[in-house]
């Protein structure tokens, strides 16, 4: 079958569009370190990357292959307010890169680093 | 109190890097539509803008207030292969502008919507 | 349990019109999506349309600008408003529905005939 240009070069895109990539996603810092409901974070979420998008097969999960971690400095409110906002550095993890991996391997991925 | 210069720029980068705005998502297309289990897309996945983010009090939630409607092409395949790729076009709406809003009055404008 | 019902099938001339109706029953949910697909004699059952509560559309390039998908929440109910319907449109078209969160299922109709045929 011979199908338009302009439909293959749209299709290419979106493939690179949707691939497993790290993409930058906010982070609840809140609920990331499940605080307590009297303290605030301001601001109250982070930005950091994550692997994302597509794999071409349902066997398949996008998955980091590396990692950087870094700080990132907030302010801390406790309510009732008895002092002002305090500067708390919290550290997170960067996915750097990832793959496609095999839903298996994942899985034995996982349980091989709880067995440790 | 008084903060360190570098601190302050820094949390203020990370309020605009994580502010509500459109985003790009990857939506699993057969997901979506739930189609029957050998029908499969390639890509497998289209690249929308979704609003996103995070606002500033728990009582806010980020909701989009303009919308652009757009259409894409992927191959579709059915399994067994009897005939080649065949092309389907997908439309949606990408989300073009958002607005921290109440929670109280994103139900209230999803119930009038429901009840028109 | 889920039931679908179809209606609206039947035999048109080519270039006519026809509307397809399938209302899902037996669920206190709202299907996610629901859509149709079609199976001529002798061949694969194909993807015709489909609609998502996720605001998506989908057509088969072979119906696109000719076929109108539609639903109607309240009643839980999709339409497939075929128009300039040609001889290689003759086919059973079967709807389905699909709950998502609540049930990954996807559900099928009987499936109604329609012959297009001077």
């Known amino acids: 079958a011979h199908y338009n240009t302009e439909i293959l070069k749209s299709i290419d895109n979106e493939w690179r569009k949707t691939q497993c990539m790290p993409r930058e996603v906010c982070i609840d810092v809140g609920k990331e370190f499940g605080v307590a409901t009297n303290t605030f974070f301001k601001p109250p979420c982070v930005s950091v990357y994550r692997c994302g998008g597509c794999c071409n097969s349902e066997g398949l999960q996008c998955m980091n292959t590396s990692t950087s971690y870094l700080s990132k400095t907030l302010f801390e409110i406790t309510v009732p307010l008895s002092q002002g906002p305090k500067p708390v550095t919290i550290s997170f993890a960067n996915h750097t890169s990832c793959r496609c991996m095999s839903k298996l391997d994942v899985y034995r991925q996982v349980h091989s680093i709880i067995r440790r | 109190a008084h903060y360190n210069t570098e601190i302050l720029k820094s949390i203020d980068n990370e309020w605009r890097k994580t502010q509500c705005m459109p985003r790009e998502v990857c939506i699993d297309v057969g997901k979506e539509f739930g189609v029957a289990t050998n029908t499969f897309f390639k890509p497998p996945c289209v690249s929308v803008y979704r609003c996103g983010g995070c606002c500033n009090s728990e009582g806010l939630q980020c909701m989009n207030t303009s919308t652009s409607y757009l259409s894409k092409t992927l191959f579709e395949i059915t399994v067994p292969l009897s005939q080649g790729p065949k092309p389907v076009t997908i439309s949606f709406a990408n989300h073009t502008s958002c607005r921290c809003m109440s929670k109280l009055d994103v139900y209230r404008q999803v119930h009038s919507i429901i009840r028109r | 349990e889920v039931q679908l019902v179809e209606s609206g099938g039947g035999l048109v001339q080519p270039g006519g019109s026809l509307r397809l109706s399938c209302a899902a029953s037996g669920s206190s949910f709202s299907p996610y999506a629901m859509g149709w697909y079609r199976q001529a004699p002798g061949k694969q059952r194909e993807l015709v349309s489909a609609t998502s509560s996720g605001g998506f559309t989908l057509y088969a390039d072979s119906v696109k600008g000719r076929f109108t998908i539609s639903r109607d929440n309240s009643k839980n109910t999709v339409y497939l408003q075929m128009n300039s319907l040609r001889a290689e449109d003759t086919a059973v078209y079967y709807c389905?529905?699909?709950?998502?969160?609540?049930?990954?299922?996807?559900?099928w109709g009987q499936g109604t005939q329609v012959t297009v045929s001077s």
């Open positions: 389905y529905t699909y709950y998502r969160e609540y049930d990954p299922e996807m559900y």
